[in-house]
């Protein structure tokens, strides 16, 4: 009986199991019972990532600079080009189709994790004893100044957005 299913890395055509083309190649002609599957390497600028029976390879992705993209890893005959974002930007998705500017942490918030090419800035509220008075994509919350270590006293309490104000101790006692 002719086969109804084929082994791994084969495909069924005309009641026959033919070898798939390996990654980095494309199909030229199906096998016969007298000759094997005919495959050719992908052209420059193209790739095929899997064992396949495609008559065309896929075009390598173009990392569009106008969208803030740049090449992270050049494509090969077996893999697509990997894009990432320019400095100060990050990908909007895992596929990195486009980039957006890293968010800044507002006053009262500090940077918990600095953004990368694929992830945005992570901000956290400044806890008691810490403050941030700038909008920044890099600055962490800073601890309030310790007046005591400077032989000073707190004249104005700090907030999550402002540092304490220190002043001299009251000598009239």
């Amino acid at each position: 009986e002719p086969p109804t299913a084929c082994r791994e890395k084969q495909y069924l055509i005309n009641s026959q199991c033919c070898s798939l083309c390996q990654p980095g190649q494309k199909l030229v002609s199906d096998c016969t019972e007298f000759t094997e599957t005919e495959c050719l390497p992908c052209d420059s600028g193209e790739f095929s990532a899997q064992w396949n029976r495609e008559i065309r390879c896929h075009q390598h992705r173009h990392c569009e600079p106008n969208q803030g993209l740049r090449v992270k890893k050049e494509g090969t005959a077996e893999s697509d080009t990997v894009c990432t974002c320019e400095e100060g930007w990050h990908c909007t998705s895992e596929a990195c189709e486009s980039c957006v500017l890293h968010r800044s942490c507002s006053p009262g918030f500090g940077v918990k994790q600095i953004a990368t090419g694929v992830s945005d800035t992570i901000c956290e509220p400044c806890p008691v004893g810490f403050f941030s008075n700038v909008s920044s994509a890099f600055e962490k919350c800073h601890p309030w100044t310790s007046c005591e270590t400077k032989d000073l006293v707190v004249q104005q309490a700090g907030t999550n957005k402002t540092d304490v104000v220190c002043g001299p101790q009251d000598r009239l006692r």
Epitope: N14, S29, E33, F34, T35
Partner: antibody, heavy 117, light 107 residues
Amino acid sequence: EVQLLESGGGLVQPGGSLRLSCAASGFTFSSYAMSWVRQAPGKGLEWVSGIGSYGGGTYYADSVKGRFTISRDNSKNTLYLQMNSLRAEDTAVYYCARYVNFGMDYWGQGTLVTVSS
Amino acid sequence: DIQMTQSPSSLSASVGDRVTITCRASQSISSYLNWYQQKPGKAPKLLIYAASSLQSGVPSRFSGSGSGTDFTLTISSLQPEDFATYYCQQYGRNPPTFGQGTKLEIK
């Protein structure tokens, strides 16, 4: 025991026709692709034509395309090669062979075709 | 069509010798190559398939290697019955094609 027995060869004039037969025994004929290979006197081997199993496709060398026709009768366990418009350069011993995994594992003893006036 | 070129066309050797026959394809055929042996007045016999696999019943002194465009058939220790003509045959592209043959003679 696998056996392949060719017949039908002989002397024929240029432009004439001949039909070769190959009687198969000792295996399930319909399950195998079959082919014809020829060898001109004192020369090397030339693949002429092939026919797939289960009524599969037919394939020809460029040198015989349009002149030769391969066929099979699975009920008679027989392979055929109809040769028309014969030329002097078709003179050769014609072998039938069984195909398995892209190789010819069993061959007949051959039949001589001579094209001459 | 793919051209198959064997070398040498003929060679003389003695019983016990190690012999290598080469076959070159005009374009890459992966490992899609067979080797056949033919004795005078007889039909060819399949020795090696898929470049390096030994056909059932063939003595282990025969071996094949190679891929792409360059292939070799090696007989590790010649026996009297090995003197014959050897052909390579590709099945990477339609139609299948043979090399011109290598005649192995007794020295």
